[in-house]
Interface confidence: low
């Protein structure tokens, strides 16, 4: 009864506290009743508030399980190749920018930017993406010229709905060359880089899709779309690979004013796509033609297209008019690459379900941080690696597939008691050797156990010491898939597990 | 077709705590989240939270922080929302309603509970 | 939290005439945001989601109901009031936690 009643206090004085708040009382007041709240607060007892606590991760995040580790390193390590046999160099910059770094560059979006609160110091702002840091890190050090890759978490106070994989911390991983090249080769090979990492994850179909922002921004013009209205009219545009275009329509007209005839205009234009052939088709457009902007846009697609046949890839790719990415940034081609669902009737397309990598050109950002203006041309591209993790984890899941949480070669094992010693110095051996070993924690462990161990944690080869064995200057090598077991002579061990992983010679 | 099937009315005294379920059917009840709103006798509706089943994940409104519990069961697919220290404003309505989703995250509610009257009275 | 501003508070159409509430939110600065939800209640009934989006027709609601505008002030509209759209109506924005609801709007016969 207590409790109850000094709960009820509590809940009057911070009532009391709210009322003197809306009544802009003054500072003095309010921290004086703030005060006398937090006493009664405390007098609640310590004990109660940690009852209270509900053990959780913060909203938006997740930790990883070893399982769900082990996808994530070699889902990176066959981007991070992908990225190195493409010459790129990596680098690193902080977790968090100066709030105006980040100030104005993501448009609408810019509200989702978590700012960290004042210390009296800085302004700072959780980084968005790794795309602004980049451009940051490009004029600050007065670089014109990189190529490099970039793998990091990144934060979005979005209210994400994870059962669906989003998050407000995600990994990115992104790829950008800077510098002033011949239009479209560095482009083309952006492109070549995404399908090459899409098909060696081997998480099923893809299409990428490309358009340009100058098309876009053209094609918006000669329907008639006022240039205030571009920006605001492209995020409507972006939403057809979810909703119909009568959808998109009344969206357009219903909410943001544009004419229906406009938007109409827009509408035979946005719902194409093709190849090659669409790119001339517009180029011969009796409107588009007269559009430098688009003009422009179309031309480096048709040289991009020639380059993409070269690398063998122009089949994964779809000039979509649709396509309006929405970040501000972009200034010129843009792609998005999406998984493909196959279809359920014959004739049907392929749909798609959900963006996996997406990128563009972005001449303008490091222009925008350079005192001078200047501006250096730059293209890339962003892995969405928590939607391939989550492919992956359900497929890993629905084939009920093993995967191994560690790189053990060798359990190191007794059979006898009162052979700690023994294990303790044949592991040290084979840690020294390079090799990945393990043993039980325990002075005389059953061999039972170490064997089960050995089994489920899915170790390939166990090495078993005996006393006779020990006589005998041997150890018993056993395999877990074959289940033979080998005399091996104490001082070619090292060899004999190398061999049978297939590892090449290392030290530590 | 999709349901949302509530507990009983209750009469709860002042400081105790009362539980309301909410059992889905018609639909995978590890897809969407369920929300709980109350409404308090001829009021508006005030939302109290929601819990994704799909990751036992839960979005709280800080006015209920403390006393408001929401659990699920996936096995029976059935959603749970607990109040504790109720007090004579707890009394209310309160529903239970299927987060509805379409372009990506914010929520409609599209499926409701019959509603669960609750009465705190000493 | 985001406070919802419903108007009017109740209003009185005749059958046939166009209906018009409107609900305004504070706080949501950008323009383009849409995430605004309409409810009909009826006495006795649970909510019934009516428009989803500012602008999006559930399925099954006649089409005489429609939402319209985007940033801080939407309405929603019945073109032709009749007997069973006597109720009261609520906006709801899922712009942030916590969701809110306007103060809601008694529609009524006149």
């Known amino acids: 009864a207590d409790r109850a009643a000094l709960e009820e206090l509590v809940r009057l004085q911070g009532a009391h506290v709210r009322g003197l708040k809306e009544q802009k009382a003054s500072a003095e007041q309010i921290e004086e009743e703030v005060t006398k709240l937090l006493k009664l607060k405390a007098q609640l007892g310590q004990d109660e508030g940690k009852q209270k606590f509900v053990l959780k991760t913060p909203k938006g995040t997740r930790d990883y399980s070893p399982r769900q580790m082990a996808v994530r390193e070699k889902v990176f390590d066959v981007i991070i190749r992908c990225f190195k046999r493409h010459g790129a160099e990596v680098i690193d910059t902080p977790v968090f920018e100066l709030k105006e770094t980040l100030t104005g560059k993501y448009g609408e979006d810019s509200k989702l930017i978590y700012d960290l609160k004042d210390q009296g110091g800085e302004l700072l702002s959780l980084r968005y993406d790794l795309t602004v840091p980049f451009a940051r890190y490009l004029a600050m050090n007065k670089l014109t010229n990189i190529k490099r890759y970039h793998i990091a978490k990144v934060y979005r106070r979005d209210n994400p709905a994870m059962t669906r994989g989003r998050y407000r911390e995600f990994y990115q991983c992104d790829f950008d060359i800077a510098g002033q090249f011949d239009p479209m080769i560095p482009d083309a090979e952006c492109l070549k880089i995404m399908c090459e990492i899409l098909s060696s994850l081997q998480i099923g179909n893809f299409l990428v899709k490309v358009n340009d922002r100058r098309i876009l921004d053209g094609m918006f013009a000669v329907c008639g779309v006022p240039d205030s209205k571009f920006r605001t009219i492209c995020s409507s545009v972006d939403k057809l690979d979810k909703v119909s275009w009568e959808e998109v329509k009344n969206e357009m007209v219903g909410e943001k004013g544009l004419a229906p005839e406009v938007a109409d205009r827009i509408g035979d234009y946005v719902q194409q796509h093709g190849g090659v052939s669409l790119v001339e088709q517009l180029l011969q457009d009796p409107k588009l033609s007269q559009n430098k902007q688009a003009v422009e846009g179309l031309g480096d697609l048709k040289l991009l297209f020639e380059y993409l046949i070269l690398f063998g890839i122009d089949d994964k790719i779809s000039f979509d008019l649709s396509l309006a990415r929405g970040l501000d940034y972009y200034t010129g081609v843009i792609y998005e690459a999406v998984l493909l669902q196959m279809p359920t009737q014959a004739g049907e397309e392929p749909l798609g379900v959900g963006s996996i990598a997406a990128g563009g050109r972005y001449d303008g950002l490091v222009g925008m941080f350079d005192p001078k203006g200047r501006k250096v041309p730059c293209v890339g591209l962003s892995i969405g690696v928590e939607r391939i993790f989550s492919i992956v984890e359900q497929r890993l899941e629905a084939s009920e597939e093993k995967v191994r949480t560690t790189e053990t070669q060798v359990l190191v094992a007794s059979a006898q008691k009162k052979l700690l010693e023994e294990r303790l110095k044949l592991v040290s051996e084979l840690w020294d050797a390079g090799i990945k070993a393990e043993l039980l924690y325990k002075k005389n462990p059953k061999l039972l156990n170490q064997l089960q161990y050995w089994e489920e944690a899915g170790i390939p080869l166990v090495a078993i010491i005996g006393e006779q064995e020990l006589r005998d200057g041997v150890i018993k090598l056993r395999s877990v898939a074959s289940r033979e077991e080998v005399d091996v002579r104490r001082e070619d061990l090292v060899e004999e597990i190398r061999r049978r992983t297939n590892q090449p010679l290392s030290t530590c | 077709q999709v349901q949302l099937v509530q507990s009983g009315a209750e009469v709860k005294k002042p400081g105790a705590s009362v539980k309301v379920s909410c059992k889905a059917s018609g639909y995978t009840f590890t897809d969407y989240c369920i929300g709980w709103i109350r409404q308090a006798p001829g009021q508006g509706l005030e939302w109290m939270g929601d819990?994704?089943?799909?990751?036992?994940?839960?979005n709280d409104n800080e006015k209920f922080k403390d006393r408001a519990t929401m659990t699920a069961d996936t096995s029976t697919s059935t959603a749970y929302m607990e109040l504790s220290s109720l007090r004579s404003e707890d009394t209310a309505v309160y529903y239970c309603?299927?987060?509805?989703?379409?372009?990506?995250?914010?929520?409609?509610?599209?499926?409701w509970g019959q509603g669960t009257s609750v009465t705190v009275s000493s | 939290d985001i406070v919802m501003t419903q108007s009017p508070d109740s209003l009185a159409v005749s059958l046939g005439e166009r209906a018009t509430i409107n609900c305004q939110s504070q706080s949501v600065s950008t323009s383009t945001y849409n995430y605004m939800h309409w409810y009909q209640q009826k006495p006795g009934q649970p909510p019934k989601l009516l428009i989803k989006y500012a602008s999006n027709l559930e399925s099954g609601v006649p089409d005489r109901f429609s939402g319209s505008g985007s940033g801080t002030d939407f309405t929603l509209t019945i073109s032709s009031l009749q007997a069973e759209d006597v109720a009261t109506y609520y906006c709801?924005?899922?712009?942030?936690?916590?969701?809110?609801f306007g103060g809601g709007t008694k529609l009524e016969i006149k």
């Open positions: 819990i994704c089943p799909g990751d036992a994940y839960t």
């Open positions: 709801q924005h899922s712009w942030e936690i916590p969701w809110t």
């Open positions: 309603a299927r987060g509805e989703e379409q372009l990506g995250l914010r929520n409609a509610m599209d499926y």
